[in-house]
């Protein structure tokens, strides 16, 4: 059986849309599948790598690598998207390409970044972890760390940094898929909203779905003990 909820929810483009949330109901009138997984049910993607989920994560990452920051021209906000999802007339798509990116580092002026920009994250304005010395962030945004401390400056002069961010990673469904969404949409979809991150590649959704003890390597499920828990 399915339980369908419909609600007007604030979406990425800053407008309210009618959204459906379909929940698979427990035939035995008990906890939901998400709750059961959290309680230690035998859910194979939490025990060992699931090829289908792995493919999904890789596909999400490939898309994210090509994403940019979509900044609304009316200063209403910005969100990480694909170029096709960013209005050509109402927004500006900030994407480093054709030598428009910053240098990799102040010591390496000639090599320019081509991966990015990322809404509210930039190697030039992140103090912790700083992109410098032996720890220069790679030219692949899907390998960027979460910035835990921004440089103390009200404005940077960069469109993708001075905008109000409207979406962050949200882990939705038992498949551990991730979307950049508004908090409202994420909560309505019963997802896990990552306030601290800017990109889906910075969060490990399956780890969140499975709960219990975190995976030793966030990318490799290792909860073999589930076999004895349930």
């Amino acid at each position: 059986a399915q339980h369908v909820t419909t609600q007007l929810v604030l979406r990425n483009k800053g407008v309210y849309e009618s959204v459906k949330y379909i929940q698979q109901e427990n035939f035995w009138i008990g906890p939901s599948s998400i709750d059961l997984i959290h309680l230690g049910a035998k859910f194979s993607p939490c025990i060992r790598k699931d090829q289908q989920i792995e493919q999904l994560v890789l596909r999400e990452r490939d898309l994210e690598r090509d994403s940019g920051c979509c900044v609304q021209n009316d200063h209403s906000g910005c969100i990480q998207t694909q170029r096709k999802d960013c209005s050509e007339t109402l927004a500006t798509f900030v994407k480093w390409q054709d030598d428009t990116g910053p240098p990799m580092d102040k010591s390496d002026l000639g090599q320019k970044r081509t991966s990015g920009a990322v809404c509210h994250q930039d190697p030039r304005t992140c103090e912790e972890p700083a992109s410098s010395g032996a720890h220069i962030w790679p030219d692949d945004i899907t390998k960027w760390p979460i910035c835990t401390e921004q440089a103390k400056s009200n404005r940077t002069g960069f469109l993708h940094m001075d905008c109000q961010i409207k979406g962050r990673p949200c882990c939705i469904s038992t498949k551990g898929s991730c979307e950049i969404t508004t908090r409202e949409y994420c909560e309505f979809m019963h997802g896990y909203f990552h306030e601290e991150a800017t990109l889906c590649s910075q969060v490990h959704c399956l780890d969140k779905v499975c709960g219990l003890l975190p995976f030793l390597n966030p990318e490799v499920p290792d909860q073999f003990y589930r076999l004895w828990l349930s």
Partner: antibody, heavy 123, light 106 residues
Framework: QVTLKESGPGILQPSQTLSLTCSFS??????????VGWIRQPSEKGLEWLAH???????YYNPALKSRLTISKDTSKNQIFLKITNVDTAETATYYC???????????????WGTGTTVTVSS | QIVLTQSPAVMSASPGEKVTMTCTAS?????MYWYQQTPGSSPRLLIY???NLASGVPVRFSGSGSGTSYSLTISRMEAEDAATYYC?????????FGAGTKLELK
């Protein structure tokens, strides 16, 4: 308001060491991303970049002069220093220090300059 | 090192006249920076990243170019624009400046 002021010996002899100080206010060199550089200008001539130093103590020198240059900072006193050893009469110039900015820029630029200090190298 | 050649070395213009000066790099650079120095004063940043006006710079100034060829334009010359203009690159160490273009008031 950001200001920088250079000070030096005014006059010195060839082969001596030139010591320059740049005292600044309105910003701190301990702030992430901040930098200050030295540029000189012989009378009625063009500008020549000498060196610059960053908040994280990263230092960059003009390779043509590198063996004779030393840049350093005293963050607590809001000062940077430049030493040039074994000076020559051709190094008579106005020496400027300048803050390095990058507001809205993919690279950096010298956004605020000091008034300069005139140094004469003469025997 | 990248050599920046500015031309002309000296030029003059009447008030209201359009002025264009060029800066040619010995090898390709991503961006050009322009500074203005009036007699007896320190240099002042005019343009960064080739075409962006620095804070407080009048809109009659504009910059353009790419690769090895860059230019600075003053749409309508004013008396206070009489100065020496320097281009600068931040593409490769050592950082280098052009020899300057001296703009005089006719």
């Amino acid at each position: 308001q950001v200001t920088l002021k250079e000070s030096g010996p005014g006059i010195l002899q060839p082969s001596q060491t030139l010591s320059l100080t740049c005292s600044f206010s309105g910003f701190s060199l301990s702030t992430f991303g901040m930098g200050v550089g030295w540029i000189r200008q012989p009378s009625e001539k063009g500008l020549e970049w000498l060196a610059h130093i960053w908040w994280d103590d990263d230092k960059y020198y003009n390779p043509a002069l590198k063996s004779r240059l030393t840049i350093s900072k005293d963050t607590s006193k809001n000062q940077i220093f430049l030493k040039i050893t074994n000076v020559d009469t051709a190094e008579t110039a106005t020496y400027y220090c300048s803050r390095i900015g990058n507001y809205g820029s993919n690279y950096w630029y010298f956004d605020v300059w000091g008034t300069g200090t005139t140094v004469t190298v003469s025997s | 090192q990248i050599v920046l050649t500015q031309s002309p070395a000296v030029m003059s213009a009447s008030p209201g006249e359009k002025v264009t000066m060029t800066c040619t790099a010995s090898s390709s650079v991503y961006y050009m920076y322009w500074y203005q120095q009036t007699p007896g004063s320190s240099p002042r940043l005019l343009i960064y990243d080739t075409s962006n006006l620095a804070s407080g710079v009048p809109v009659r100034f504009s910059g353009s170019g790419s690769g090895t060829s860059y230019s600075l334009t003053i749409s309508r010359m004013e008396a206070e624009d009489a100065a020496t203009y320097y281009c600068q690159q931040w593409n490769t160490y050592p950082l280098t400046f052009g020899a300057g273009t001296k703009l005089e008031l006719k």
